[in-house]
């Protein structure tokens, strides 16, 4: 017997799709060897139609895929737009030739079934409405009209013109005539459920002179759309349920054994397992909406359904749309930290991966907010101004070609705790969710700036020092001037660097920056930080006020400006942590209204197109001492 296993017989109808799963023994060789799907010919030769090596035959072009799931020891062959010509014998198998390990699969594709001439076939999806048309002769114009459903030999009345309605069709069935028509009546059945399927008979009149019509009603469960996504990537469920439910609450649920558990709905319900990584966005006034989930995990795989009902919960007989999500563990998206920890007054440096092939894409960082359907307003971007409330403490450092950019947030407060998203206007799969946890500081900060009340006088020399501990001895120290388009590195002087590392004196490790002479435009936020190559570490910020020599009052009270920076920062901004639940997420609708519209986020900053280059000191009056 072959160790490969799959469905022996697959049957479908023209125009449909099939997904054939083949199971193989879990060995390293099997996981990585070629997978194939071939058609058995009369001559015994099996002609390859598709393989995991990238081969795709002409007859399968644009309608088939083969996906390997090594973690499950399975591979799936999807074939769409079936025709009767696809009927035949096939093999799914493993190996460099089509004579290796295989399993025989018989595929039969039939024509869409036909019914007797007098039977009208109605095909509707669950939750929709069917209108059954019933014709009659003039002689029965004033006779009783009815619709019954065949159950074995009997035909049970569903509704009739005497206003009788079967209890199971109450509030769902109506019998009516249109305009002045004298030879046709109609029956509407709404909120269709699977048990409504079957053969119906319309009747006008009684006895042998009665006019009868047969109607075959097929109520279809939604065919799930198959979605294949990589681990840590994102998925968007596009839901279009039609105008008739435009004003009802919408939901996305995940099917389990007994029920469909709501993940998110427009009434504010959200599943905690998706905290910080899910977003529901209305698309238009016709009831279309989308749900975006980022940071996909293996356990996110499964069956999803979107629907509409005033309760925001799944309800039998209401329209639904379905998907089956597969999460492939062989992901191109690197594993990045999902929880970053900081302390009040301290800083965090968050590394955001992006598709290295898209180094010129615009980079963004947004804060997920849990109100209503969730949103994620952009806080900073390569061409977006830093949002109000984050001036002087937030910067994005792009590192072109490295496949990552860094976002630094300092002067942390407990209000900064929450979920943040890294995203670009390029490959929409590369969206990562970070949970920032800010705890109260329990010790002095590692980086300290003196003087703390920094007021410089125009025309004079002003020096500011940053004290760092010995643990930062080998790291690069820098000063930068913060502006809305980044933090521009300044020349600085490291006074601790002259000592040998063996005799590091904790008290004399200083990196200083001098403004000589001080100009009015030197006023603003300055950061002292440490980094190793492209890896940014801790930072601290100080506001430097600039005043005229003659005036006594500074432009801004530096004590107030620096208040945020005085709390003791963290010991280790990004201590390693286990992956923790990242919950509800929702983004700025302008970013997520459509996968293609993310570039519009840059429009916030039309007047400021400079990018925050962390390596530039241009335009600054800082100089080395």
């Amino acid at each position: 017997q072959s160790p490969i296993f799959g469905p022996q017989d697959v049957s479908s109808i023209e125009g449909n799709s099939v997904s054939i799963t083949c199971y193989y023994p879990d060995t390293s060789v099997n996981r990585h060897t070629r997978k194939y799907w071939c058609r058995q010919g009369a001559n015994g030769y099996c002609a390859t139609l598709i393989s995991s090596n990238g081969y795709l035959s002409k007859e399968y072009s644009g309608r088939a895929s083969l996906i390997n799931f090594p973690e499950n020891s399975t591979f799936v062959i999807n074939i769409a737009h079936l025709t009767q010509e696809d009927t035949g014998s096939y093999k799914c198998g493993l190996g460099t030739t089509n004579r290796g390990l295989f399993f025989d699969v018989s595929l039969e594709v039939s024509q869409v079934p036909e019914f007797p001439n007098d039977t009208h076939v109605y095909t509707k999806d669950i939750g929709r409405t069917v209108t059954i048309e019933c014709r009659f002769k003039e002689g029965n114009a004033h006779s009783k009209k009815s619709l019954c459903k065949k159950r074995g030999e009997a035909c049970e009345v569903v509704i009739d013109s005497t206003e009788y309605v079967d209890p199971s069709y109450k509030d769902r069935a109506i019998l009516f005539m249109k305009g002045t028509s004298r030879d046709i009546f109609y029956v509407n059945i709404s909120h269709l459920i699977p048990s409504d399927a079957g053969l119906y008979v319309c009747q006008a009149g009684e006895g042998p002179s009665a006019d009868k019509n047969n109607a075959d009603l097929q109520v279809l469960e939604p065919e799930p759309e198959l979605l294949y996504k990589d681990l840590r990537s994102s998925v968007t469920f596009e839901c279009d349920l039609g105008r008739e439910v435009a004003n009802d609450a919408k939901y996305l649920c995940r099917k389990n054994k007994e029920t469909c558990d709501v993940i998110i709905n427009t009434l504010g319900k959200r599943d905690p397992a998706f905290e910080g990584r899910i977003l529901l966005t209305p698309r238009d006034d016709n009831g279309r909406f989308s749900v975006l989930i980022t940071g996909l995990r293996k356990e996110d795989a499964g069956h999803y359904q979107c629907g509409a009902h005033s309760s925001g919960l799944p309800q039998e007989g209401w329209p639904v749309q379905a998907w089956q999500l597969f999460v492939n563990e062989e992901s191109t998206i690197p594993n990045s930290r999902s929880v970053v920890k900081g302390v009040t007054g301290g800083s965090v440096a968050i590394v955001c991966p992006y598709n290295p092939k898209e180094s010129s894409s615009l980079k963004y960082w947004c804060h997920w907010e849990a109100d209503e359907n969730g949103r994620c307003p952009v806080l900073v971007g390569t061409q977006a101004l830093v949002q109000e409330g984050y001036e002087g403490r937030l910067a994005l450092f792009d590192q072109p070609g490295s496949g990552a950019y860094t976002v630094i947030l300092n002067q942390l407060t407990t209000q900064d705790s929450g979920f943040y998203w890294c995203l670009t206007d390029g490959d929409s799969r590369w969206r990562t969710t970070i949970e920032l946890q800010v705890a109260e500081a329990t010790k002095k900060p590692d980086l300290e700036v003196t003087p703390q009340n920094a007021t410089a006088v125009i025309g004079e020399t002003f020096t500011i020092s940053c004290h760092y501990p010995c643990k930062f001895y080998s790291q690069e120290k820098y000063w930068c001037k913060w502006s809305n388009d980044g933090c521009h590195i300044l020349p600085s002087h490291d006074e601790g660097a002259r000592q040998s590392s063996v005799s590091c004196d904790q008290s004399s490790q200083i990196v200083s920056m001098t403004l000589n002479p001080v100009k009015k435009e030197d006023e603003g936020w300055y950061w002292c930080g440490v980094k190793e190559g492209q890896v940014y570490g801790e930072t601290t910020a100080i506001y430097v006020a600039v005043e005229e020599r003659t005036r006594g009052s500074p432009h801004i009270n530096p004590t107030d400006a620096n208040a945020r920076a005085k709390d003791a920062p963290e010991e280790e901004a990004m201590e390693s942590s286990v992956r923790e639940d990242e919950n509800k997420a929702n983004l700025d609708p302008r970013l997520f209204a459509d996968e293609r519209e993310i570039q519009n986020a840059g429009d916030q900053a039309q007047e400021n197109r400079a990018s925050g280059n962390a390596g530039s000191a241009g335009g600054q009056s800082g100089s080395s001492k």
């Epitope: 296993f5 449909n16 799936v76 699977p194 069956h303």
Partner: nanobody, 130 residues
């Protein structure tokens, strides 16, 4: 509450045929997959056959030991599944259990694994005499 009721078991001679039925009932229970497993005294539960459907597409799976002899089918409504047993052998003697799934599972889940089935019947005994 979902119920699976097997019928059709009994005594049959070697080489003979038997047809087992399994009816699923329960308000709004609309199964997505149904299957048959069997258990002989002192042995583990063994996969016999399964049928899975999605819209107008049907997938049939058959266990190695019954390949070419047993076939699985279902009625048009999808709530009853049949196991046609032909050319039976003494080693086919076992209690035959019906299984059902209401939720479409990830298609990478192996139908041969009893743990991945949600609902089970009480079983029907098939005895093959030589």
């Amino acid at each position: 509450e979902v119920q699976l009721v097997e019928s059709g078991g009994g005594l049959v001679q070697t080489g003979g045929s038997l047809r087992l039925s399994c009816a699923a009932s329960g308000r709004t229970f609309s199964p997505y997959a149904m299957g048959w497993f069997r258990q002989a005294p002192g042995k583990e539960r063994e996969f016999v056959a399964a049928i899975r459907w999605s819209g107008a597409t049907t997938y049939k799976y058959v266990g190695d030991s019954v390949q070419g002899r047993f076939t699985i089918s279902r009625d048009a409504a999808g709530n009853t599944v049949y196991l046609q047993m032909n050319s039976v052998k003494p080693e086919d003697t076992a209690v035959y259990y019906c299984a059902a799934d209401r939720v479409p599972k990830d298609i990478s889940i192996d139908p041969r694994n009893p743990k991945d089935w949600d609902y089970w019947g009480k079983g029907t005994l098939v005895t093959v005499s030589s």
